[in-house]
């Protein structure tokens, strides 16, 4: 057999035995002569250096460039490839010699008591146990222990080759501590040397760079990059780095194994790249590759190197942010800078602190924006190294979809006496103000008798056929007043009023307000009754713990069976396809109340008294009367509002003042509370008594001291008291100048 590439000028060395394989018996002599065209050398098994004592290589007597290899008394271990080659070339001729030694069928490595085989637990990998044979056609099996297991060639993935050894999938013997080959010759077993099995891993789970991204430095700073490889057990890792300035003077690489918890199925390796003082040329892509021999994984990161620390706002930084009430608002501080700046947010000059409603960080987040969040927000970026500052103002405008004030106050059904003039009001608050408020109407019976898609408590009127109030044919005569603007509870509101000239027909009225961010509507049930009349005694709006009575008066000749009910807090659910039932026709939603009946010559009066009214007593009260002739039920509904008790407070301050003798002092003290507090004035802690010069007006709210005298100087106290306590404010009045002599003197 010939090995290597043929040379133009040289022929291959020629062997005296012209065979690829030679089989000889043990104890015989092996002799092979090799001839060629230049200096030759021999290589033989088990000793590549040519120092073996038993092997003799001699020059031929009959010619130049000829050498004879002689081995007397060959043994099984001499089995192998014998190679004759030209010195310093690849040109060679090879013969494979089997020395059949039935007492020692396996070739042993010189001085080896045992060998080592390295395997990986890869399902697809095979391993070769190098138990070579001195006989080519042996029946060889592989024994593995412990526990003992025998593997026999299967003509597929398990095989034995005398020149190579025993081939087997590595996972099959990964459990074993040692393996050996065994041959059976004439019922005799012959074993190769033992091979220790060493399982080596190869799997790399991941390679992680830290920091992983966004690495920024300025010239002269130290760069430290950590590359961590996580692998399976029994793995060795080789790290390789690629980076822009490979010839770096101040580069340092440290590789080490990291300790993992005992019992861990994983190993960790760390490679740290350090560059002490980076330059602009160190900017670029840094790649760390970890290799286990059978597997390589890599990871990259970009390192940016700035000339010096800096800070600036990015081009995408907003100056105006528009939002609608209730939305989440995010205003990111878009900046360019190194190192990352300190970010501070201010609203109208006041620093913002994070809490559950607002997060002031890289992004200013307002969880649920409200009107009071409107304003100018300033973000100040400070470079932590250079202390350079940049500021930017963002205006936040919060829009409010139209909200109709009365919506929360008015009951779903209110009754109006036939023939009366009534005014319906919609007070709209919206930002920006509504660009229109339109009124619509519809006959009550049309609405109540149309099949509806869905009716809910929030929208009890399923009707769709709304008509403009300009078209009041078949309804009440209407006039829409021009919108007015009012400051209510400190807010600019738009008030739209609709005047019903004469309440003749029961109808529904709807006001609809629209602005750029939404719409709001209020449906008013305008139920006209000729029936009973409700009055409240003694007050329209009682305060908690006061008593109130509802009087229902009906003409005795027309009506009978007067009954008081309270509308339940939640009317019964109305199912899809059902109609909203007028209060009178659905007594299931009503609670019957105890009341006392009185009569006079013409009327019956049913009085329902609430002693110690509470907030729970608020709601819609229904007086039901039955027509004596037709037995038809008539209902009147009245909403009762109970005011909460509020301790007295005094709005505004009394201020110390200096006045000259003979001038006047006018001060006012406005108190609020429920029940309304009584106001009293004191001078130097004694009750102030009215006289010709001291005048108290408007329920003692306003104090006037005319033609002040020196003795009017002192501490003045305004005190507002109710059953819930007192509130007071004080001021000192200084009177300057000399007292004029009076005529009496």
């Amino acid at each position: 057999a010939s090995v290597g590439l043929p040379s133009v000028s040289l022929d291959l060395p020629r062997l005296s035995i012209q065979k690829d394989i030679l089989t000889i018996k043990a104890n015989t002599t092996l002799q092979i002569t090799c001839r060629g065209q230049r200096d030759l050398d021999w290589l033989w098994p088990n000793n590549q250096s040519g120092s073996e004592q038993r092997v003799e290589v001699t020059e031929c007597s009959d010619g130049l460039f000829c050498k004879t290899l002689t081995i007397p008394k060959v043994i099984g271990n001499d089995t192998g490839a014998y190679k004759c080659f030209y010195r310093e070339t690849d040109l060679a001729s090879v013969i494979y010699v089997y020395v059949q030694d039935y007492r020692s069928p396996f070739i042993a490595s010189v001085s080896d008591q045992h060998g080592v085989v390295y395997i990986t637990e890869n399902k697809n990998k095979t391993v070769v146990i190098p138990c070579l044979g001195s006989i080519s056609n042996l029946n060889v099996s592989l024994c593995a222990r412990y526990p003992e297991k025998r593997f026999v060639p299967d003509g597929n993935r398990i095989s034995w080759d005398s020149k190579k050894g025993f081939t087997i999938p590595s996972y099959m013997i990964s459990y074993a501590g040692m393996v050996f080959c065994e041959a059976k010759i004439n019922d005799e077993s012959y074993q190769s040397i033992m091979y220790i099995v060493v399982v080596v891993g190869y799997r790399i789970y991941d390679v992680v760079l830290s920091p992983s991204h966004g690495i920024e430095l300025s010239v002269g700073e130290k760069l430290v990059l950590n590359c961590t490889a996580r692998t399976e057990l029994n793995v060795g890792i080789d790290f390789n780095w690629e980076y822009p300035s490979s010839k770096h003077q101040h580069k340092k690489l440290v590789n080490r194994d990291l300790k993992t918890q005992s019992g861990s199925e994983m190993k960790k390796f760390l490679s740290t790249l350090t560059i002490d003082g980076v330059t602009r040329s160190d900017q670029g892509l840094y790649t760390c590759a970890a290799s286990s021999g059978l597997m390589t994984k890599k990871n990259s990161t970009f390192v940016r190197v700035h000339e010096k620390p800096f800070v600036a706002f990015g081009s995408g930084m907003e100056s105006l942010v528009e939002a609608t009430v209730g939305e989440r608002v995010r205003i990111p501080a878009k900046y360019l800078g190194y190192p990352p700046p300190e970010i501070k947010w201010y609203k109208n000059g006041i620093p913002l602190e994070s809490n559950h409603t607002i997060k002031a960080g890289h992004v200013l987040t307002i969880m649920e924006v409200s009107e009071r969040d409107t304003g100018n927000y300033t973000v100040i970026l400070t470079n932590p190294i250079s202390k350079e500052k940049q500021s930017h103002v963002v205006s936040l405008v919060v829009y409010v979809p139209p909200q109709i004030g009365e919506k929360s106050l008015i009951s779903p059904v209110d009754s109006y006496q036939y023939g009366t003039t009534q005014t319906l009001t919609c007070t709209v608050y919206a930002i920006p103000p509504p660009h229109h408020i339109h009124w619509y109407w519809q006959l009550e019976e049309e609405c109540a008798n149309e099949p509806s898609q869905a009716v809910s408590v929030t929208n009890p009127y399923p009707c769709e056929e709304w008509r403009s109030v300009e078209d009041f044919q078949g309804g009440n005569k209407i006039e829409v007043n021009k919108n007015q603007f009012a400051l209510i509870e400190g807010k600019n509101k738009t008030v739209s009023t609709l005047v019903i000239q004469a309440a003749n027909v029961s109808a529904l009225y709807k006001c609809e307000a629209v602005n750029k961010v939404g719409r709001g509507e209020r449906v008013i049930s305008f139920h006209v009754t000729r029936g009973p009349e409700i009055t409240l005694q003694p007050d329209m709006q009682p305060t908690e713990q006061e008593s109130v009575s509802l009087w229902c008066t009906a003409d005795r000749s027309t009506f009978e069976n007067l009954t008081w009910y309270k509308l339940g807090p939640q009317p019964l659910p109305i199912h899809v396809g059902e109609l909203p039932t007028p209060v009178c026709k659905n007594l299931d939603t009503l609670w019957k109340l105890n009341a006392t009946m009185f009569s006079n010559s013409t009327n019956d009066i049913l009085i329902m008294e609430l002693k110690n009214a509470s907030l729970q007593d608020q709601g819609d009260y229904v007086c039901l009367a039955q027509d004596r002739k037709t037995k038809k039920r008539h209902c009147v509904v009245r909403q009762l509002t109970v005011l909460e008790r509020v301790a007295p407070t005094i709005t505004g301050n009394l201020e110390n003042q200096t006045t000259s003798i003979g001038e006047s002092i006018e001060v006012s003290c406005t108190a609020s509370g429920n029940p309304p507090p009584q106001i009293m004035w004191f001078k130097d802690n004694e009750t102030l008594v009215e006289d010709s010069g001291i005048v108290l007006k408007d329920g003692n709210r306003n104090l006037t001291i005319r033609r002040v005298r020196k003795e009017d100087e002192g501490l003045y106290t305004c005190q507002a008291c109710s059953v819930l306590g007192c509130a007071k404010v004080e001021a000192f009045f200084i009177i300057e100048g000399a007292q004029e002599k009076t005529n009496l003197e």
Epitope: T535, Q537, P538, E546, S547, V548, S549, W551, T596, F598, N600, S601, I605, I607, E609, K611
Partner: nanobody
Framework: QVQLQESGGGSVQAGGSLTLSCEVS????????MGWFRQAPGKEREGVAG????????YYANFVQGRFTISQDNAKNMVYLQMNSLKPEDTAIYYC?????????????????WGQGTQVTVSS
């Protein structure tokens, strides 16, 4: 100072009659409304009858309708309650009450001034 003084109470057989008087001082019965209340043992005080400003209209609780009559004498500044066909369940302390001009004091919360009360006992 407003004062209301009841008189005319006493014991009577069922079916009998009594007239209660209420003498009012410091308060005009002609320009205000007046009423009568009663409180039976273990029960709440309840309105019996009322008369409005100037005596224009009179009001009666259902349980006394047709049996009791309220009236006033503006000259004497007196209010009366004529009780006929008395029943054992009419047994109570009867109070005179003064209210604002309108409405008549048929319930406690709109009463301004009270009398001390007079006992009426009806036996079967």
């Amino acid at each position: 100072q407003v004062q209301l003084q009841e008189s005319g109470g006493g014991s009577v057989q069922a079916g009998g009659s009594l007239t209660l008087s209420c003498e009012v001082s410091g308060y005009s019965v002609n320009s205000n409304s007046m009423g009568w209340f009663r409180q039976a043992p273990g029960k709440e005080r309840e309105g019996v009858a009322g008369i409005n400003e100037g005596g224009v209209s009179t009001y009666y609780a259902n349980f006394v309708q047709g049996r009791f009559t309220i009236s006033q004498d503006n000259a004497k500044n007196m209010v009366y309650l004529q009780m006929n066909s008395l029943k054992p369940e009419d047994t109570a302390i009867y109070y005179c009450a003064a209210g604002a001009p309108d409405p008549p004091p048929l319930i406690e919360s709109i009463v301004k001034y009270w009398g001390q009360g007079t006992q009426v006992t009806v036996s079967s």
